[in-house]
């Protein structure tokens, strides 16, 4: 009689994560007597997957009834497959021995590959806010997919972006992979309502890409524009001066009125109005008692927006002149040091 052969007919088996893998194995003879064991990997570090004789293997079931005397089918099913199960599986016949069974013959091995979906992409933006016309970086990460081939695209408000760099790791063979991409986005004043989207397409997703989003409202800072105007006289000795704070984002804003450099009043923006583009407008007014001043008064509206250096706009109030409505024609004064805070 011919010597027993262990036949693993499948060189490779491909299974989707979460499914059951069937690993086929048959023996050509009932002799010698002895159990079958399944291992992942070869050599001394191999991992026992199933032992016909003893042990508890909750994820493994046999295709045939191994207790039947004439059984020569030693195929197994492994349930709830994950990428960690990938590897080469060997069906090994042992010969009954004393005290231990002796390895007799091994199958050629079956390589189990696992297809796994990428995780939902996570998009993160810069740690600090940036102002319009500046370029900011967004990163997108997705993990745990297999095979390695994957497509990543960036969009801003539905328009595809081209300035990005993507890496898939590791470079070599692995049971699963990760993708990391960095996109550069130029901010505009209209970006408060904008979204940046990272879209990942993979064969396992069957045409339904995964998307991660970031709202530019978390990233952008739109500095305010200031306008100081003198309103018509309320009484012969009173002048109403307003400071219009326009097109700012986020809402966090503190305004200080100064009369000839001395703090008159400080207030925090509360009842703001929202513009269509998501920015805010706010107005503060100051009632100046002209009769209390002998000389001309320099009124300054100083605004500290979102913790940035203050910007200010001044208005010269002529005490000698008969009070009438007049616009502000003085240049803005920037009490901060950063030119880009003035628009």
């Amino acid at each position: 009689e011919e010597e027993l052969q262990v036949i693993q007919p499948d060189k490779s088996v491909l299974v989707a994560a979460g499914e059951t893998a069937t690993l086929r194995c048959t023996a050509t003879s009932l002799i010698p007597v002895g159990p079958i064991q399944w291992f992942r990997g070869a050599g001394p570090g191999r991992e026992l997957i199933y032992n016909q004789k003893e042990g508890h293997f909750p994820r493994v079931t046999t295709v045939s009834d191994l207790t039947k005397r004439n059984n020569m089918d030693f195929s197994i099913r492994i349930g709830n497959i994950t990428p960690a199960d990938a590897g080469t599986y060997y069906c090994v016949k042992f010969r009954k021995g004393s005290p231990d069974d002796v390895e007799f013959k091994s199958g050629a091995g079956t390589e189990l590959s696992v297809r796994a979906k990428p995780s939902a992409p996570v998009v993160s933006g810069p740690a600090a806010r940036a102002t319009p016309q500046h370029t900011v970086s967004f990163t997108c990460e997705s993990h745990g997919f297999s095979p390695r081939d994957i497509t990543l695209k960036w969009f801003k408000n539905g328009n595809e972006l081209s300035d990005f760099q993507t890496n898939v790791d590791p470079v070599g063979e692995s049971v699963s992979y990760s993708i990391h991409s960095t996109a550069k986005v130029v901010l505009t004043r209209e970006d408060v309502h904008s979204q940046v989207i990272c879209e990942v397409a993979h064969v396992t997703l069957q045409g339904d890409p995964l998307r991660g989003t970031a709202n530019l409202s978390e990233t952008i800072r739109v500095p305010p524009t200031l306008e100081v105007t003198q309103q018509p006289v309320r009484a012969e000795n009173q002048v109403n001066v307003t400071c219009q704070v326009r097109k700012f984002y986020p809402q966090r804003l503190q305004l200080t009125w100064l009369e000839n450099g001395n703090v008159s009043r400080t207030e925090t923006a509360s009842t703001v109005t929202e513009n269509k583009d998501g920015t805010y407008n706010w107005m503060s007014w100051l009632l100046v008692n002209v009769s209390a001043h002998r000389d001309d008064v320099k009124l300054t509206c100083q605004v500290e927006h979102d913790g940035q250096p203050a910007v200010s706009k001044s208005h010269d109030l002529k005490v000698s002149a008969h009070p009438k409505e007049q616009g502000s024609n003085t240049a803005a004064e920037n009490t901060g040091s950063n030119e880009r805070n003035i628009y």
């Epitope: 060189k11 490779s12 491909l14 299974v15 989707a16 499914e19 590959s113 297809r115 095979p147 081939d149 497509t151 397409a201 064969v203 396992t204 069957q206 045409g207 339904d208």
Partner: antibody, heavy 119, light 110 residues
Framework: EVQLVESGGGLVQPGGSLRLSCAAS????????MIWVRQAPGKGLEWVGI???????YYATWAKGRFTISRDNSKNTLYLQMNSLRAEDTAVYYC?????????????WGQGTLVTVSS | DIQMTQSPSSLSASVGDRVTITCQAS??????LSWYQQKPGKAPKLLIY???NLASGVPSRFSGSGSGTDFTLTISSLQPEDFATYYC????????????FGGGTKVEIK
């Protein structure tokens, strides 16, 4: 048993329209990508279009504008609406289901339905 | 769009013969290649997917190999029920999704 059954084929005049159906049983259509493939008499296989599990459709360049794939999840049925039919659209039309591991292969096929475009 | 070139377009072989069919993609498709068997009047049947994986219920005499642009289907010992037409099919994505079939190889009895 997992099965696909096409229907709706027949004789149609050039310029006419036809709607093919593909009834699925043994699985939910909304969990797999589904493809339409056609085969002209004595010729090879040609993909027409595909629908993703969420209902997004993709078409072969030549099929865009004339052919529309849709799905009725409540009836577990896939459709192929064919308009402005030409003689060269004469073929057996197959629907097929993508594998669970991805939409690069198709492991369940219907028996096909013959569409003849002729005056 | 990607083109799949299958060869030969037909071949004659005897039962027990080893048969090899090749498929070439016009650009790299990684391992996204499937093989189907079709008998007259019947629907195609999946044999091999992802270049080398045997579909459920397919005899082990069928095997597939290759990656990139060149792929092979091998029938180690041709059986009477294997006389049929065989098609390769690719999946590819660049700017849009694309599935393409080869022209087919008819395996006839010698």
């Amino acid at each position: 048993e997992v099965q696909l059954v096409e229907s709706g084929g027949g004789l149609v005049q050039p310029g006419g329209s036809l709607r093919l159906s593909c009834a699925a049983s043994g699985f939910s259509l909304s969990t797999y990508a589904m493809i339409w493939v056609r085969q002209a008499p004595g010729k090879g296989l040609e993909w027409v279009g595909i629908i993703s599990p969420s209902g997004t459709t993709y078409y072969a360049t030549w099929a865009k504008g004339r052919f529309t794939i849709s799905r009725d999840n409540s009836k577990n049925t896939l459709y192929l609406q064919m308009n402005s039919l030409r003689a060269e659209d004469t073929a057996v039309y197959y629907c097929a289901r993508a594998g669970s591991g991805g939409w690069d292969y198709f492991n369940i096929w219907g028996q096909g339905t013959l569409v003849t475009v002729s005056s | 769009d990607i083109q799949m070139t299958q060869s030969p377009s037909s071949l004659s072989a005897s039962v027990g013969d080893r048969v090899t069919i090749t498929c070439q993609a016009s650009q790299s498709i990684s391992s996204y290649l499937s093989w189907y068997q079709q008998k007259p009047g019947k629907a195609p049947k999946l044999l091999i997917y992802y270049a080398s994986n045997l579909a459920s219920g397919v005899p082990s005499r069928f095997s597939g190999s290759g990656s990139g642009t060149d792929f092979t289907l091998t029938i180690s010992s041709l059986q009477p029920e294997d006389f049929a037409t065989y098609y390769c099919q690719s999946y590819y994505y660049s700017n849009n999704y694309n599935w393409a079939f080869g022209g087919g190889t008819k395996v006839e009895i010698k």
